[in-house]
């Protein structure tokens, strides 16, 4: 049987909602960029459905996405990164829905990594540091980071701090003594590119010292 939809399938397809969203990752693998798209409705029957990007490409008119389970994916050096491309959901040669998108406005950075917290006894503070692969990149170098931390027992009571550097100091007196904290960080493009928050880094856990009764300070 052909991989293309029969006429009846096409009529059914036109009744479905093929809304989709995409994000780009620039220089995600050396000089290669990636583009990932997925349907907003997880129940869409993706059999026979393909994604294609046309325009604002180098040396080619269009590129087809690879399908990886429920997502559609391209990794290539061929994005011009200037102007708008047309991204379409297709059945055979028929386009079901399309979006004109500038790939530099849907950038999702890579998640920060190597998050750690060091307690400085003399300074009575915690120095939070993390790393990002974007420091080495040509394009998406400037990021805003969101550091979120909470006392482990407070399920949804996250405190957020926005910063542009990869180092943050938390004052000991702002934290509860003898408590276990969870901390994590994510990034979003800032200046020159637009887009979405990265995935969260893996969480790091640290314990605050107990209060020293004689001085009223933490040990």
């Amino acid at each position: 049987e052909s991989g293309y939809a029969q006429n009846g399938d096409l009529e059914d397809a036109e009744l479905d909602d093929y809304s989709f969203s995409c994000y780009s990752q620039l220089e995600v693998n050396g000089s290669q960029h990636s583009l990932t798209c997925a349907f907003e409705d997880p129940d869409v029957n993706t059999t026979n459905l393909e994604f294609e990007i046309c325009g604002a490409l180098v040396e080619v008119k269009c590129l087809n996405f690879r399908k990886l389970q429920e997502i559609y994916f391209i990794e290539t050096k061929k994005f011009l990164l200037i102007g708008k491309s047309n991204i379409c959901v297709k059945v055979g040669e028929k386009s079901l829905t399309c979006k004109k998108i500038d790939l530099t406005t849907i950038v999702k950075p890579e998640a920060p990594f190597d998050l750690s917290v060091i307690y400085r006894e003399g300074a009575n503070d915690f120095v939070v540091t993390f790393n990002t692969s974007h420091l080495q990149k040509k394009y998406v170098k400037v990021l805003m980071h969101d550091v979120a931390y909470r006392q482990e027992k407070d399920e949804n009571k996250w405190t957020h701090v926005n910063l542009s550097s990869t180092k943050l100091t938390l004052l000991q007196r702002k934290l509860q003594p003898a408590a276990m904290y969870e901390i994590k960080v994510r990034s979003i493009p800032d200046h020159y590119f637009k887009g979405f928050w990265s995935e969260w880094s893996p969480s790091y856990y640290f314990r605050t010292p107990e209060i020293n009764n004689s001085s009223g300070e933490m040990d």
Epitope: K61, I82, G83, K100, T104, Y192
Partner: nanobody, 118 residues
Framework: EVQLVESGGGLVQAGGSLRLSCESS????????MGWFRQAPGKEREFLAA????????HYSDSVKGRFTISRDNAKNTVYLQMNSLKSEDTGRYYC???????????WGQGTQVTVSS
């Protein structure tokens, strides 16, 4: 109704420099790609340089790479083409274009003449 206006052209000696400007009255300028082209007498219009909406990404034709620089000022709705080490073959009418959508430029200016004398 004029939406793109080029300026800065003129007569210059070989080896000299010129800076072209293109002012846009299009409301979406700050989110649009911009490009520069030229048309030499009796020849087709050729692409020279393009710049993304924020100025972070630029692209040049081999014929001008290293000599021409494209830049933009989104606060002034203006794109520039700095042209150095000009040659007689750079003579022509220079056009700016705005909003590159699926390989088609949506808006064009009327052009400004550049003549390089040897």
């Amino acid at each position: 109704e004029v939406q793109l206006v080029e300026s800065g052209g003129g007569l210059v000696q070989a080896g000299g420099s010129l800076r072209l400007s293109c002012e846009s009255s299009i409301s979406t300028f700050s989110s649009d790609a911009m490009g520069w082209f030229r048309q030499a007498p009796g020849k087709e219009r050729e692409f020279l340089a393009a710049i993304g909406w924020s100025g972070a990404v630029t692209h040049y034709s081999d014929s001008v790479k290293g000599r021409f620089t494209i830049s933009r000022d989104n606060a002034k709705n203006t794109v520039y083409l700095q042209m150095n080490s000009l040659k007689s073959e750079d003579t022509g009418r220079y056009y700016c274009a705005e909003d590159y959508v699926t390989d088609v430029w949506q808006y064009w200016g009327q052009g400004t003449q550049v003549t390089v004398s040897s």
